[in-house]
Interface confidence: medium
């Protein structure tokens, strides 16, 4: 992973997270070069024998690509000339997590930067009024999470209240045996209040809000990836 040579160029990466089964981006930028044929991009990963991806002389060079990444990687070829070395990773796997190195060679010099890539599953929760229940009940559902998250309920009226005694959360393994469906039920709901179902693991934090009044129900969802930093 070491580099040598008198000249060094600035390479910048951003820590990110990938959603299992979906496509992800490993971000990397560098000081651009006017000549595409002089740019070499190598992506490496700790614990992997071959390369993750290599781009040189204006095209992919995949003879040394490790089998676990075969057919799953691509750079944005039209953006390399402006200093974008980001890697698109298709069908993110749990095992894609780890430390990656973006290594750049241009006519100006060499440079590299590490990137921490987390993998998991995260999805927007949906909060609904459960009309089948015997009492006023809210049901919060999110289809895909991994690792197992925590679920916390909060309310606008009863700020700081602990709802753990009046809620029940279950985790149901999905068919691929990795991710899980999250279902949390909140009992004894009062009208004219806004309730929040907050789901969080070390990858992401998601919130589903529901405002229940006599005349209407309003919903809002928000998802935020955690620990993404330059």
């Amino acid at each position: 992973f070491g580099i040598s040579g008198r000249h060094s160029i600035t390479v910048t990466t951003v820590a990110s997270a990938g959603n299992i089964g979906e496509d992800g981006i490993l971000s990397c930028t560098f000081e651009p070069d006017i000549k595409l044929s002089d740019i070499v991009i190598q992506w490496l990963k700790e614990g992997v024998l071959g390369l993750v991806h290599e781009f040189k002389e204006g095209k992919d060079e995949l003879s040394e690509q490790d089998e676990m990444f075969r057919g799953r990687t691509a750079v944005f070829a039209d953006q390399v000339i402006v200093g974008n070395a980001s890697l698109r990773l298709k069908n993110v796997q749990l095992t894609d997590a780890g430390t990656y190195k973006c290594y750049i060679i241009t006519s100006k010099g060499k440079g590299n930067a590490n990137l921490e890539y987390k993998t998991g599953a995260f999805s927007m929760p949906e909060v609904n009024v459960d009309y089948n229940a015997s009492s006023e009940t809210l049901r919060c559902e999110a289809p895909r999470w991994f690792p197992q998250p925590t679920v916390v309920w909060a309310s606008q009226v009863d700020q700081g209240a602990n709802f753990s005694e009046v809620s029940n959360t279950s985790f149901e393994l999905n068919s691929e045996n990795v991710t899980m469906k999250v279902v949390s039920v909140l009992y004894n709901v009062t009208i004219n209040n806004t309730y929040s179902c907050m789901i969080e693991n070390d990858i992401a934090k998601a919130t589903g809000d529901i405002k229940v009044t006599e005349s209407e129900i309003k919903r809002r969802s928000h998802l935020q990836l955690l620990n993404s930093k330059a």
Epitope: E46, G47, G50, L51, S63, T95, G98
Partner: antibody, heavy 116, light 107 residues
Framework: EVQLLESGGGLVQPGGSLRLSCAAS????????MHWVRQAPGKGLEWVAS????????YYADSVKGRFTISRDNSKNTLYLQMNSLRAEDTAVYYC?????????WGQGTTVTVSS | DIQMTQSPSSLSASVGDRVTITCRAS??????LNWYQQKPGKAPKLLIY???SLQSGVPSRFSGSGSGTDFTLTISSLQPEDFATYYC?????????FGQGTKVEIK
Amino acid sequence: EVQLLESGGGLVQPGGSLRLSCAASGFTFSSYGMHWVRQAPGKGLEWVASISSSSGYIYYADSVKGRFTISRDNSKNTLYLQMNSLRAEDTAVYYCARASSGMDVWGQGTTVTVSS
Amino acid sequence: DIQMTQSPSSLSASVGDRVTITCRASQSIRSYLNWYQQKPGKAPKLLIYYASSLQSGVPSRFSGSGSGTDFTLTISSLQPEDFATYYCQQYYSTPLTFGQGTKVEIK
């Protein structure tokens, strides 16, 4: 069927040489990195060397560095281990293994005995 | 070099028992850990990769857990064919290193 078959083991005197081969079948050999792992009689597993799919990345255990050479011929679907300056402590069963998510396919092993 | 230490080195158990084998790395290896099973005179067989992922074709009674420095292989209900030696192996960095092995014997 995915298979690895080692050959080339035998009895050799200290200081002598041997070349082990590992013939691969049932998968696209040129797409996978490969390892050599050995096991001395009654002992545990010891990693020896690794080579990436197109031979650009090669790694050795300190105990064999400078004496052993790992190589491959993708046109022949074959992995090699050239062993020179053999010592008594190199006596072991030598396995080749495919590098995937873990060493997921192993050969049956070939026995190397270094003795005078 | 990263040292891998397994415990116990051997254990006696009966069919149906829950068996736990631990593996400790001398430094953090994140989740870069594999578990292998080896029977006398046979090549090792991959059971678990990346600390907790079950290799295709391996019975679900085998499971792996842990990250960083401490890892566990669990056999939920020991079967007659599970009596063997088990090895952990790190692939966080070269040299790749194995634990010394844990022999699971019939009680």
